[in-house]
Each structure stands twice: as structure tokens, then as C-alpha cells.
């Protein structure tokens, strides 16, 4: 096809792919009519003046994966019609200015995973067509002003896994098309007010994983059509009253990883379109009542691995439509019989890993829909009378790690087990406490009357028999919980970022394998 | 008759790791929960972690990071492991059970501990 | 975390007298609902293992003798030998568990 280099394979799409060590310069001769070219994994150090000079109908070029840490400032020359450019994953410290001039079509820019130490405005001042471009994984440690004024095309801008400790207040200010701004990953301790107004069209922001302290109250207030907010992993001790109100397109916002120790009323003002919110591992210590009223079609609720130890009644009002709730890993000793009221639609609860010590008997009154129930390492000693018997779809009930008191009071409770057994799992069943003298003996099969030999045992009324079959016909194994392997964050769907920890039995939030993704 | 055992126990470098063990006999671990302690010489004592019959585990919350406590039951074993080891956490280190006591998280039995010296 | 703070640091009494240790913590060890305070006190004699005193502030473990009691509700609380004998010489120590257990720094109990 027109000759193709011996080092390179050449298709009769006019695409050409040169990979291989023993490539150490740009083959040649390329074909003419070559639009697309990869040179990938090779050991080029070096792209010298125009090597593609005779391929002027290039429309993409990707030169990765290679020893690449010198360009001449017109290696690029004659390509005219390239809009897509790669450099990702090289040994570039430094871009020469002009680098990218008469790249009049360029609309992506990939220059991700080299050790780039700064960038100048004059670097991308001739690509004013740019819609992407990708800087993460370099050694930025700032950006100056101007950096990218003549981007006023560019819709994702990618500066993560950089160096960077602040950030000016004007570098993205002409920037109205830009849809995605990633700036996860740098060591930003505070972002100033205004940086992001001139953002207008903003859907994505990822700001996770920098040591960010304080937010400004209207940090987001010109950001209206956000829809993916990630703050986690960083150092915010407090959220402004009203910083979250002017974002009613968002359905997305992780604040785990942090140091909050309070949310007020209302913090989380109008968004209807959030499904998720994840705010485990903080420090939080109370919830007041309202805290996520705004929230109407919140379905999953992550807080656990805080320090909750107060529960407003009404700290779930609105919350219809939740399916998930994760309070384990807190230091709850009580509950009100009405917090979860609410929440007529919730399907998964988990309190495991508190210090529960009495449940109130109308705690699951209203949540009628409850499949799955983790109560595992608390400091239980019984259950009242009937807590359990309208909850018809329950399949999974963990009641392990209890110190369940084995005295003439625990038999209705094990009466209600012993019919619904399968419920319990087959790992691990909860076992006596005390009396010393049946400590360790499963509680299903406990004899009440050798526990406690001197008491009359009277006849106690058993919890009423409840099908475990839930009233589905089918039920598919992916909603069964699993404590032990479970994903520690929602996965921030990046294609550049797919990252997914896997943990031990500390892990997030005790819920269902299939939800938790 | 209960009895506790730890071992495991030594001179670690700083930024090592350790891995102690308790063996227990008199008892099963899938009745009984087994808490580590430690105390520097001369010191108090610092409640490190449990871990209880059903495998469920609760953590001193600034070490929690470092530590894992794990068991296996057909060995009778309990094991924790203390990862980025520095010079304050050489110690005598105990496990110990709750046998008789009515207090869930009381510990009745002790055993006689393992010293752990971290020093390079 | 709850702070449990003892005093005094240490206490010579002599045979047969009265030994009394206090210990605060920061916030209330009191449940409500389970009317317990979730404080225990230990014993540890010189080159041994502590020993389980008492629970639930004043519960005195099986085989630890009566002179031996403790009282107090909320975040004060007394650890009292009413006659001091030689095999009492320890360093005692409260632990709270209505959070995860902390422990006291520990008084140290000898003979005058």
C-alpha cells in the first residue's frame, strides 16, 4: 500500500501501527495516504524537524509508550489536517514553544503520564479548534495564568495526578465550553473563590484526592449543569451552608475520605437527580433532623465508618425512595422506634459494627420491603417481641457477634430463628453470652431450660412463623449481601481512572456485591 | 483448663512489620472472643483489637490502619498483624478472652505475653 | 475516643488501711436504657497479667474478695480496698467499654 516500512503493519484503511524495541527513529518511507499512524512501545528518544513531512492528509497520530524525551519545535510541521495527537505515556520534561503551530485542525491533545514540569500560554496559543486535552500524570506544579485562554473550544481538561498546590482564580476563566475538569490527585489545599465561575457549561468536576481544607460558600454557585461532583479524599472539616444549593442537575457527589464532623439542615440543597451519596469515613457524630430532606430520589446512603452516635428522629425525612442505607462502623448505642419510618422503600440496612444495645420494637415498623438486615457486632442481648414479623422479602438477617443473653426471655426470639433459619446464613450463627454456663452455645438450638434451671419457663408466645421465600418467584443471587469482599468507593467512571479497591471485612458498607458498584 | 499463648514476638526493624500469635486451648474461637493488649514497659496498657466468635473485628481507631487481627478456628488461633512498625510500639504483647465475666468486653483470661522490640 | 483519666498517679496506705483510686472519664459511661455504667477495673501485680476486678462500675468478678468494691455513675468513679493487704500491691486500672475499651494510665498501689 503505497510502501509500507518493514518495523510497521499498514492496513487498507490507510492506518499504519510501527511498534517493536528494535524501532529506535520514525520509519520511512510512510505511506502518503496514511491517516491514521501509531507508533507505539518502541525506543525512538527523539522526534527530529518534520519526519512526517510527506503524510499531510494525517488525521491521527499516537506516539506512546516510547523513550521519547526530545522534540524539535517543527516535528509536526505539514500536518494540517491532524486532529488527534497523542504523546501519552513518554519521557517529555519540557515542550518546546510552537511544538504545536499550523496544527490548525487539532481538536485532541494527549499528553498524559510524561514528567512535563510546566506549561506556558504560548504552548497551546495557536490550537484554537482543542476540545480535549489530557496533562494528568505530569509534574505540573502550577498553571499560570493564561495557560489556556485560546482553548475557548475545549470541552475536558485533564490536570490530575499533577503537583499542583494552587491554582489562580483566572486560569480557567475563558473556558465556557468545558464540560469535564479534572483536577484529581494534586496537593490543592484550598481553591479560590471564582476559580471555577466561568465554568458555565460544567458537568464533571473531580477534585478528589488533593488535601483540600475549606470550601468557599459559592464555589459552584455559576456551575449549574454540574452533574458529577467528586470531593472525596481530601481534608474539608465543614461544608458552607449554602455551597451545594445552586446544583439541581447533580447525581453524583462522594465526600468519603474526609474530616467532617457535622451536616447541617438543608447542606445538601435541591438535587433531585442524586441517587448516591457517599460520606463514609469522616468524623461525623450526629445527624439532625432534615439533614437530607432535598434528597427525594437519594436510593443509596453511605455513612459509615464515622463516629455517629446520635441519630435525630427525623434525620431521613424525605429520603422515599432509598434503597440502601449504611450506618455500620459508627458508635451508635440507640436508636428512635421512628428514624427509619421514612423510608417505605428501603431494601438493604446495615448497622453492623456498632454498639447497639436494645433495638426498639417498631425500629423496622414501616419498612415493609427489607431484604437484608446486618446487626452483626453489637452489643444486643435480645430483640423485642415481633421486630421482624411483617418484613415478608427478608432473606438476610446477620445477628452474629451479639452478646445474646440465653435467659427464659430469648425464647420467642428463638423460636421466630429456628423457623427462619436460612435467613441467618450458614457461616455464622449468633450464640449465647450469657449465662456463663451456655457461653458459645448456638442460640437456635440453646436449651432455655438448662440456661436458666431455677426459673419457670412459661409459656411464651413465638414469633409468628414468616416464609423466608421472598414473594418474588425469582431472586437473583446478585442481590444477596456479602460483608466481606465489597467494593471501599463508587467508581468514578473515568476512562483514565479505574481504579476499584477491593477490602476486608472493614470495608465500606456491608451492602449487596451487585449494588455496590 | 483455659489457657492463652502468645508468640511471635522479637526485635523488628522500624518500618517492619510483625505477626504474633495466640493459641488457645480450653475453648473454641467460634464461642469466644479473643482481644490483643499491649503495654510498654512501665506503661499502661492499650487495648489493640478484637476479634469475635463470628469473625467480626473492632479496632483501636489510631492504630486501625496498621493492624489486622485474624483467627483461624480449627487451629485455635488468633493472629495479629502490625504493619509500619516504629520505636513506640515495643511492648509486651497479651491476649486475652472473656471466660467466665458477664462484661462482653471484660477479659477474665490473660496470657502471659510476648515482647516485641522494635529497633533497628 | 473517651479519655479515662485516673488519680492519683500512685498511693502508699498502709496494711489495713483504706486505698481509694478515681477515675474520670470524658463523657458518661452511663446507658440510659440498660441503667449500666460500662467501666471495669483490672489489677496487674508486678511481672504478671491483669486481672479482671469488677464490671459495670460496681459488679465484682466471681472469686475477687469483698474488700475489694467499686461505686460511681456517670463519669466519676471509685475504686475502693477497704482494708489493705500485702498481696494488693498492683497498678490498677479503669477501662471504659461504652465506647471501644480505653484504658486509665493507672495507679500504682504500695505499702507506707
Known amino acids: 500500500y503505497h510502501g509500507c516500512p518493514s518495523e510497521c503493519t499498514c492496513s487498507r484503511a490507510s492506518q499504519v501501527e510501527c511498534t517493536g524495541a528494535r524501532i529506535v527513529a520514525v520509519p520511512t518511507p510512510l505511506p502518503w495516504n496514511a491517516m491514521s499512524l501509531q507508533i507505539l512501545n518502541t525506543h525512538i528518544t527523539e522526534l527530529n524537524e518534520s519526519p512526517f513531512l510527506n503524510i499531510s492528509a494525517l488525521i491521527a497520530l499516537r506516539i506512546e509508550k516510547n523513550e521519547l524525551s526530545r522534540i524539535t519545535p517543527g516535528a509536526f510541521r505539514n500536518l494540517g489536517s491532524l486532529r488527534y495527537l497523542s504523546l501519552a505515556n513518554n519521557k517529555l520534561q519540557v515542550l518546546p514553544i510552537g511544538l504545536f503551530q499550523g496544527l490548525d485542525s487539532l481538536e485532541s491533545l494527549l499528553l498524559s503520564s510524561n514528567q512535563l514540569l510546566q506549561i506556558q500560554p504560548a504552548h497551546f496559543s495557536q490550537c484554537s479548534n482543542l476540545k480535549e486535552l489530557q496533562l494528568h500524570g505530569n509534574h505540573l506544579e502550577y498553571i499560570p495564568d493564561g495557560a489556556f485562554d485560546h482553548l475557548v473550544g475545549l470541552t475536558k481538561l485533564n490536570l490530575g495526578k499533577n503537583s499542583l498546590t494552587h491554582i489562580s482564580p483566572r486560569v480557567f476563566q475563558h473556558l465556557g465550553n468545558l464540560q469535564v475538569l479534572r483536577l484529581y490527585e494534586n496537593r490543592l489545599t484550598d481553591i479560590p473563590m471564582g476559580t471555577f465561575d466561568g465554568l458555565v457549561n460544567l458537568q464533571e468536576l473531580a477534585l478528589q484526592q488533593n488535601q483540600i481544607g475549606l470550601l468557599s460558600p459559592g464555589l459552584f454557585h455559576n456551575n449549574h449543569n454540574l452533574q458529577r461532583l467528586y470531593l472525596s479524599n481530601n481534608h474539608i472539616s465543614q461544608l458552607p451552608p449554602s455551597v451545594f444549593m445552586q446544583l439541581p442537575q447533580l447525581n453524583r457527589l462522594t465526600l468519603f475520605g474526609n474530616s467532617l464532623k457535622e451536616l447541617s439542615p438543608g447542606i445538601f440543597g435541591p438535587m433531585p437527580n442524586l441517587r448516591e451519596l457517599w460520606l463514609y469515613d469522616n468524623h461525623i457524630s450526629s445527624l439532625p433532623d432534615n439533614v437530607f430532606s432535598n434528597l427525594r430520589q437519594l436510593q443509596v446512603l453511605i455513612l459509615s465508618r464515622n463516629q455517629i452516635s446520635f441519630i435525630s428522629p427525623g434525620a431521613f425525612n424525605g429520603l422515599t425512595e432509598l434503597r440502601e442505607l449504611s450506618l455500620h462502623t459508627n458508635a451508635l448505642q440507640d436508636l428512635d422506634g421512628n428514624v427509619f419510618r421514612m423510608l417505605a422503600n428501603l431494601q438493604n440496612i446495615s448497622l453492623q459494627n456498632n454498639r447497639l444495645r436494645q433495638l426498639p420494637g417498631n425500629i423496622f415498623a414501616n419498612v415493609n420491603g427489607l431484604m437484608a438486615i446486618q446487626l452483626q457486632n453489637n452489643q444486643l442481648e435480645n430483640l423485642p417481641l415481633g421486630i421482624f414479623d411483617h418484613l415478608g422479602k427478608l432473606c438476610e438477617l446477620r445477628l452474629y457477634d451479639n452478646p445474646w443473653r440465653c435467659d427464659s426471655d430469648i425464647l420467642p426470639l428463638r423460636n421466630w430463628l429456628l423457623l427462619n433459619q436460612p435467613r441467618l446464613g450458614t457461616d455464622t450463627v449468633p450464640v449465647c453470652f450469657s449465662p456463663a454456663n451456655v457461653r458459645g452455645q448456638s442460640l437456635i438450638i440453646i436449651n432455655v431450660n438448662v440456661a436458666v434451671p431455677s426459673v419457670h419457663v412459661p409459656e411464651v408466645p413465638s414469633y409468628p412463623e414468616t416464609p423466608w421465600y421472598p414473594d418474588t418467584p425469582s431472586y437473583p443471587d446478585t442481590t444477596s449481601v456479602s460483608s466481606t469482599t465489597e467494593l471501599t468507593s463508587p467508581v468514578e467512571d473515568y476512562t483514565d481512572l479505574t481504579t476499584i479497591q477491593v477490602t476486608d471485612d472493614r470495608s465500606v458498607w456491608g451492602m449487596t456485591q451487585a449494588q455496590s458498584g | 483448663e483455659v489457657q492463652l499463648v502468645e508468640s511471635g514476638g522479637g526485635l523488628v526493624q522500624p518500618g517492619g512489620s510483625l505477626r504474633l500469635s495466640c493459641a488457645v486451648s480450653?475453648?473454641?474461637?467460634?464461642?469466644?472472643?479473643v482481644h490483643w493488649v499491649r503495654q510498654a514497659t512501665g506503661k499502661g496498657l492499650e487495648w489493640l483489637g478484637v476479634?469475635?466468635?463470628?469473625?467480626?473485628?473492632n479496632y483501636n481507631s489510631h492504630l486501625m490502619s496498621r493492624l489486622t487481627i485474624s483467627k483461624e478456628n480449627a487451629k485455635s488461633s488468633v493472629y495479629l498483624q502490625m504493619n509500619s512498625l516504629r520505636a513506640g510500639d515495643t511492648a509486651m504483647y497479651y491476649c486475652?478472652?472473656?471466660?467466665?465475666?458477664?462484661?462482653?468486653?471484660?477479659?477474665?483470661?490473660w496470657g502471659q505475653g510476648t515482647t516485641v522490640t522494635v529497633s533497628s | 475516643d473517651i479519655v479515662m483519666t485516673q488519680s492519683p498517679d500512685s498511693l502508699a496506705v498502709s496494711l489495713g488501711e483504706r486505698a481509694t483510686i478515681n477515675c474520670k472519664s470524658s463523657?458518661?459511661?452511663?446507658?440510659?436504657?440498660?441503667?449500666?455504667?460500662?467501666l471495669a477495673w483490672y489489677q496487674q501485680k508486678p511481672g504478671q497479667s491483669p486481672k479482671l476486678l469488677i464490671y459495670?462500675?460496681?459488679t465484682r468478678e466471681s472469686g475477687v474478695p469483698d474488700r475489694f468494691s467499686g461505686s460511681g455513675s456517670g463519669t466519676d468513679f471509685t475504686l475502693t480496698i477497704s482494708s489493705l493487704q500485702a498481696e494488693d500491691v498492683a497498678v490498677y486500672y479503669c477501662?471504659?467499654?461504652?465506647?471501644?475499651?480505653?484504658f486509665g494510665g493507672g495507679t500504682k498501689v504500695e505499702i507506707k
Open positions: 480450653g475453648f473454641s474461637l467460634t464461642s469466644y472472643g
Open positions: 486475652a478472652t472473656h471466660m467466665i465475666t458477664e462484661d462482653y468486653y471484660g477479659m477474665d483470661y
Open positions: 477501662k471504659q467499654s461504652y465506647n471501644l475499651p480505653t
Open positions: 476479634i469475635w466468635a463470628g469473625g467480626s473485628t
Open positions: 463523657q458518661s459511661l452511663l446507658n440510659s436504657r440498660t441503667r449500666k455504667n460500662y
Open positions: 459495670w462500675a460496681s
